[in-house]
């Protein structure tokens, strides 16, 4: 706490300007009116105040707005935002995308801090859903943002927002997240033609079921190996050799280099060796000729 002392004669601040830069802690406390500070917050960023001075300015705002800052002040916090705690931010009601952008700009180039995570959480909860403009903004600042959300949180993303998602935004998503995002992407892109559809849906395919992969195999899509390796193992296993060949097109040759890795390894174990040999890649480990394959999971389902 800063002691309450009278402001020395002639030092009362009439505006927030660079003359305050060498005010001591107690002088700032005594000579700067909190209401003046609130209306001229945008000027603070142009003045290199020290941490000690910024703490005094924050304290003045906290006293003026004990229930949380109004959005008019929040939008102009600038670098003072980095001095806020998640507890401070939980008191705010941020509704404007411009305010969100202004504060994310301050943290640009850095990892997502607890302050930023709290701010985003408050903003999204206030909006009720992760709309396209918000998602656009968040992924522009934090490409990995989408993959930091739980499957439950992702379920509130409307299909229309999927248009804002770039392939790199999904780089760190796990299968559970892609399971939620894929049906939304399928819905969002459903009116596109074959090749355009594949370009858009490609990065979401880690959540695709077998029947959708079978359908894609009929469309000459030429899926690359990197995408194939990210497919769900359970979705790849039922595909026939012919379907995989059609799905990968000229990239089918890449299977040889990946034969020891999932899902290729597990898929090979489920194929007849005869069928694998038709690829001419030297893939080994298929079911020997003359063996009968019983699908026990299907048998259990029937009984």
């Amino acid at each position: 706490e800063v002691e309450k002392t009278a402001c020395p004669s002639g030092k009362k601040a009439r505006e927030i300007d660079e003359s305050l830069i060498f005010y001591k802690k107690w002088e700032l406390e005594a000579c700067v009116d909190a209401a003046l500070l609130a209306t001229q917050m945008d000027r603070v960023n142009a003045i290199p105040f020290t941490y000690e001075q910024l703490d005094v300015l924050k304290h003045k705002l906290d006293e003026l707005y004990p229930q949380g800052y109004p959005e008019s002040v929040i939008q102009h916090l600038g670098y003072l935002f980095l001095k806020m705690s998640p507890e401070d931010i939980r008191k705010w009601n941020v509704t404007s995308l411009e305010t969100l952008k202004a504060l994310l700009e301050v943290n640009k180039g850095h990892e997502m801090s607890p302050q930023v995570a709290t701010l985003i959480d408050r903003f999204v909860k206030g909006r009720g859903q992760l709309d396209k403009d918000t998602l656009d903004t968040l992924t522009a600042f934090y490409p990995g943002y989408l993959c930091s959300l739980s499957p439950e949180e992702l379920s509130s993303v409307p299909p229309s927002s999927i248009w804002a998602v770039r392939p790199q935004d999904l780089d760190t998503c796990d299968p559970r997240q892609l399971d939620v995002l894929y049906p939304k992407a399928r819905l969002a892109f459903q009116n596109m033609n074959g090749s355009e559809y594949f370009v858009k849906i490609q990065s979401f395919l880690g959540g695709a079921p077998t029947e959708d992969l079978k359908a894609l195999s009929q469309q000459n899509v030429s899926m690359d190996l990197a995408t194939f390796m990210k497919l769900r193992t359970d979705a790849v296993l039922p595909l026939t050799v012919a379907e995989v060949q059609k799905l990968l097109g000229p990239h089918v040759e890449g299977l040889k280099a990946e034969e020891r890795h999932r899902p290729v390894r597990d898929w090979i174990l489920r194929q007849r060796q005869d069928d694998l040999d038709t690829l001419g890649l030297g893939l080994q480990g298929g079911i020997p000729n003359g063996y009968l394959v019983l699908d026990l999971s299907m048998q259990e389902a029937l009984s």
Partner: antibody, heavy 120, light 106 residues
Framework: QVQLVESGGGLVKPGGSLRLSCAAS????????MSWIRQAPGKGLEWVSY????????YYADSVKGRFTISRDNAKNSLYLQMNSLRAEDTAVYYC?????????????WGQGTLVTVSS | IQLTQSPSSLSASVGDRVTITCRAS??????LAWYQQKPGKAPKLLIY???SLESGVPSRFSGSGSGTDFTLTISSLQPEDFATYYC?????????FGGGTKVEIK
């Protein structure tokens, strides 16, 4: 890219004067507070003087107060240090440095320095 | 605010882990920066806000600490790291520097 180039250093007798200049380029000079920092031979760094973006707020270290004058010309993207009544202990490399904008008050870009030698 | 660096100099070999400390005469929160200076060159900013790495600085450099005690660590010393290192506080004016730590080749 950001560049700061100092000039004006040299050999001067005790009691003499010297004017250092710093030419800035690669950034909006008028948006930044600027500093002079010096380093005596084999010694550490000393923050000597500081000037606000408009030039109206100035700081001097006690060791140079009343003898040195900092100024700037935003139209010419230049920073100056007028040094009067020089003493042997003012012998140092003088660096012009830009003060970063943002939460931290630090020196994000420095010039290569100019050597001032005060000796009879 | 006075900053005291230790040691004032140290000898180390390439690949060594090197630790330099900076102690403030009073609490300065995380308001501390570290600079590297090579002979005949201007100082270069390495770390700010005690632990944030300046853009373009190798990840072998790291900073830690808060209050009065701070540390600069070089996880695996490289030939280009032999230099003098300075800390600087920006908690309050006047801004001050530590006395420096010279890292020499053993």
């Amino acid at each position: 890219q950001v560049q700061l180039v100092e000039s004006g250093g040299g050999l001067v007798k005790p009691g003499g004067s010297l004017r250092l200049s710093c030419a800035a380029s690669g950034f909006t000079f008028s948006d930044y507070y600027m500093s002079w920092i010096r380093q005596a031979p084999g010694k550490g760094l000393e923050w000597v003087s500081y000037i606000s973006s408009s030039g109206s707020t100035i700081y001097y270290a006690d060791s140079v107060k009343g003898r040195f004058t900092i100024s700037r010309d935003n139209a010419k993207n230049s920073l100056y240090l007028q040094m009067n009544s020089l003493r042997a202990e003012d012998t140092a490399v003088y660096y012009c440095a830009r003060t970063s904008r943002g939460l931290c008050v630090l020196f994000d870009y420095w010039g290569q320095g100019t050597l001032v030698t005060v000796s009879s | 605010i006075q900053l005291t660096q230790s040691p004032s100099s140290l000898s180390a070999s390439v690949g060594d882990r090197v630790t330099i400390t900076c102690r403030a005469s009073q609490g300065i929160s995380s308001a501390l920066a570290w600079y590297q200076q090579k002979p005949g060159k201007a100082p270069k900013l390495l770390i700010y806000d005690a632990s944030s790495l300046e853009s373009g600085v190798p990840s072998r450099f790291s900073g830690s600490g808060s209050g009065t005690d701070f540390t600069l660590t070089i996880s695996s010393l490289q030939p280009e790291d032999f230099a003098t290192y300075y800390c600087q506080q920006f908690n309050s004016y006047p801004l001050t520097f530590g006395g420096g730590t010279k890292v020499e080749i053993k």
